[in-house]
């Protein structure tokens, strides 16, 4: 047994240092532009290798039932790249805006870029000298000062434009010990606003020949956000390159060169004056609707995943926003035999599913003051700022003839309570503001509207179960807003917080 | 809640080398930054060095050029290779960890570095 184990080990060895040396990154100090060529990545190392394998042993083997393999028809769901072929080119100090779906590859793309996640095809070229902005502000132990210079040398002009920039003067100036104040242990503690800005302020003092800016206003205020955007990202920095992830309608007509991403892919790269001459159902869409960027940063990427579902290159014709599918919530074969007898009606009771408590200190995704993460079990609706699905489409890995069967299945799976059988989706409906929403990226029905109201206006718990087929009536798919699969990175962001 | 435990602390000649590791457990999925602090007799506790989400690594002045922070982050682990180690490098050496969207901050509970001829 020991000698196969080493056989084994050796072979795989020498597999590894026959494989050809790949230089997908190309850092070059005099370079000033920015590019990324046909970039495709997966989440795991080796993934598309594996990934053309499952394929093929797939084509060979058949299960019993004469369907094909079970794993290998899982694996194809779980195989989607994280990104697929990226294309775009930026010349020294430009701002390249990026926006997109919910789990469409926006911070994996900053990853790539920084030689975190390591592309299968492609090149990426630009000097190495990045600073990089997380869309999770954080702080060390330490003062105000420290935690903005630490590790890079001081320069007091540079400081104090930043400090300027950023809008920490107000802050910075009540305090007695100025910017000698201590954070953290021992010390004051911040808002998630200023917290945002302290950590927009280390990234944009580091020098460097590329800013990484992965949503870097939550917290802040829609007017405190134009602000710190203008004073900060476009004259501060104006002739540094900058790369911002964004969903705002305001920073894509700023920018020099917006790039959408829809699904880990492409879906529009360009000016903003190219995209409405290029797609003006899209653009209009996003602009006619009414202060769209006055929207929670939630609710924008909940829109703006809708429209690009519906107005995706690959899917069919565009739908207007007023027309809606009626198709009946209906089953057939296997699909049926799995459900449960009853169901719940999310107008006879409340809905058990995706209702998240908030606290006064919770409005809008804000987690102000509060000492440790609240822990994410219920919630499908991405919160916060961020905008990246942290929990995904339920059942990832489940089977089917069809891909829209299989994310109707599992939508029923999670009413049931026929995944996830140990997650308690009960809750005393204690507070004032809840969300309701079936999928991270379905924009309000009328149910959800209603059953948000009526949640509002009971303080009962959540128990009446009634029969399923009055839920058929009042659940309908729209096919274009439905995403057919799961992405790689929503299902790898699902792993990672919850590996422990 | 997070834990850190530190490792490799110990009695060195001036000049010498040490590696220190520290591995994070417990509620480990959004880590935002990991790093060391030092604490030097009838001092204040003080950064070293630090290495934050997309590798951004940053050195207090006193230690750079001689101190490289690295991360395993399949493992949560984060290690400090101290090389050309003087006299004045002499502290408790406490791992660091800042995680989750609020920003919480955890501690090892520090491991003695001494050098010392």
């Known amino acids: 047994q020991t000698w196969y184990d080493s056989l084994g080990a050796i072979n795989k060895i020498q597999d590894f240092l026959q494989k050809q040396e790949y230089k997908t990154l190309e850092y070059n100090l005099t370079t000033t532009e920015v590019v990324m060529e046909n970039v495709t990545a997966f989440w795991e190392e080796g993934f598309g290798e594996l990934f053309e394998k499952a394929k093929q042993n797939n084509n060979n083997r058949k299960t019993s039932n004469g369907d094909d393999s079970l794993f290998f028809s899982n694996f194809s769901l779980l195989g989607t790249p994280v990104l697929k072929d990226i294309n775009f080119k930026i010349e020294r100090g430009q701002l390249l805006a990026v926006a997109g779906s919910t789990g469409a590859g926006k911070t994996s793309l900053l990853m790539v870029i920084m030689g975190e996640l390591e592309p299968s095809e492609g090149k990426i070229k630009h000097s190495g000298r990045i600073s990089f902005c997380s869309q999770f502000s954080w702080i060390m132990p330490g003062t105000i000062k420290e935690n903005i210079i630490f590790g890079v040398s001081y320069d007091e002009y540079r400081y104090r434009s930043v400090i300027k920039a950023c809008q920490l003067e107000e802050d910075i100036s009540k305090f007695a010990e100025k910017d000698n104040i201590v954070l953290g242990e021992g010390g004051i503690t911040l808002s998630g606003g200023q917290r945002a800005r302290i950590s927009l302020a280390r990234a944009v003092y580091k020098d460097a020949d590329l800013y990484l800016l992965d949503s870097p206003f939550g917290y802040l205020d829609v007017l405190t956000e134009k602000e710190i955007f203008e004073s900060c990202v476009c004259k501060l920095m104006a002739n540094k390159t900058r790369i911002l992830v964004t969903s705002k309608m305001e920073h894509l007509k700023k920018a020099d060169k917006i790039l959408i991403l829809h699904e880990g892919s492409s879906y529009f790269y360009g000016t903003f004056s190219e995209l409405q001459n290029l797609q003006p159902d899209f653009s209009s869409k996003l602009m006619g609707c009414d202060s769209f960027d006055q929207f929670s940063a939630e609710r924008r990427n909940s829109i703006l995943t809708e429209t690009l579902h519906r107005f995706s290159l690959e899917g069919d014709a565009p739908v207007s926003w007023t027309e809606t599918k009626k198709q009946s919530f209906k089953q057939t074969g296997e699909f049926g035999e799995k459900r449960k007898n009853s169901i719940l009606n999310p107008i006879n009771s409340i809905r058990k599913f995706s209702i998240v408590q908030k606290t006064p200190l919770q409005m809008n995704g804000i987690e102000e003051d509060s000492d440790e993460p609240l822990e994410r079990r219920l919630s499908l609706v991405p919160d916060s700022e961020q905008g990246e699905a942290i929990l995904p489409r339920i059942s990832v890995i489940s089977t089917g003839p069809t891909l829209q069967a299989r994310r109707r299945q599992s939508v029923l799976n999670l009413m049931t309570h026929s995944v996830n059988q140990g997650q308690n989706i009960h809750r005393k409906t204690t507070a004032s503001t809840r969300k309701v929403s079936l999928a991270p990226q379905a924009n309000l029905t009328e149910l959800d509207i209603y059953s948000r109201r009526l949640s509002q206006e009971t303080g009962l718990e959540i128990s009446e179960e009634i029969n399923e087929e009055d839920l058929k009536e009042c659940f309908f798919d729209d096919m274009e807003s439905i995403p057919a699969v799961t992405t790689w990175n929503t299902y790898l962001r699902y792993i990672t917080v919850h590996k422990s | 809640q997070v834990q850190l435990q530190e490792s490799g602390g110990g009695l060195v000649q001036p000049g010498g080398s040490l590696r220190l590791s520290c591995a994070a457990s417990?509620?480990?999925?959004?880590?935002?930054?990991m790093g060391w602090y030092r604490q030097a007799p009838g001092k204040q506790r003080e950064p070293v060095a630090i290495?934050?989400?997309?590798?951004?690594?940053r050195y207090a002045e006193p230690v750079k050029g001689r101190f490289t922070i690295s991360r395993d982050n399949a493992q949560n682990k984060v290690y400090l290779q101290m090389n050309s180690l003087k006299p004045e490098d002499t502290a408790v050496y406490y791992c660091?960890?800042?995680?989750?969207?609020?920003?919480?901050?955890?501690w090892g509970q520090g491991t003695q570095v001494t050098v010392s001829s």
């Open positions: 660091w960890l800042n995680w989750g969207r609020t920003s919480v901050n955890s």
């Open positions: 417990g509620s480990t999925s959004s880590i935002n930054a």
């Open positions: 290495s934050s989400s997309g590798g951004d690594t």
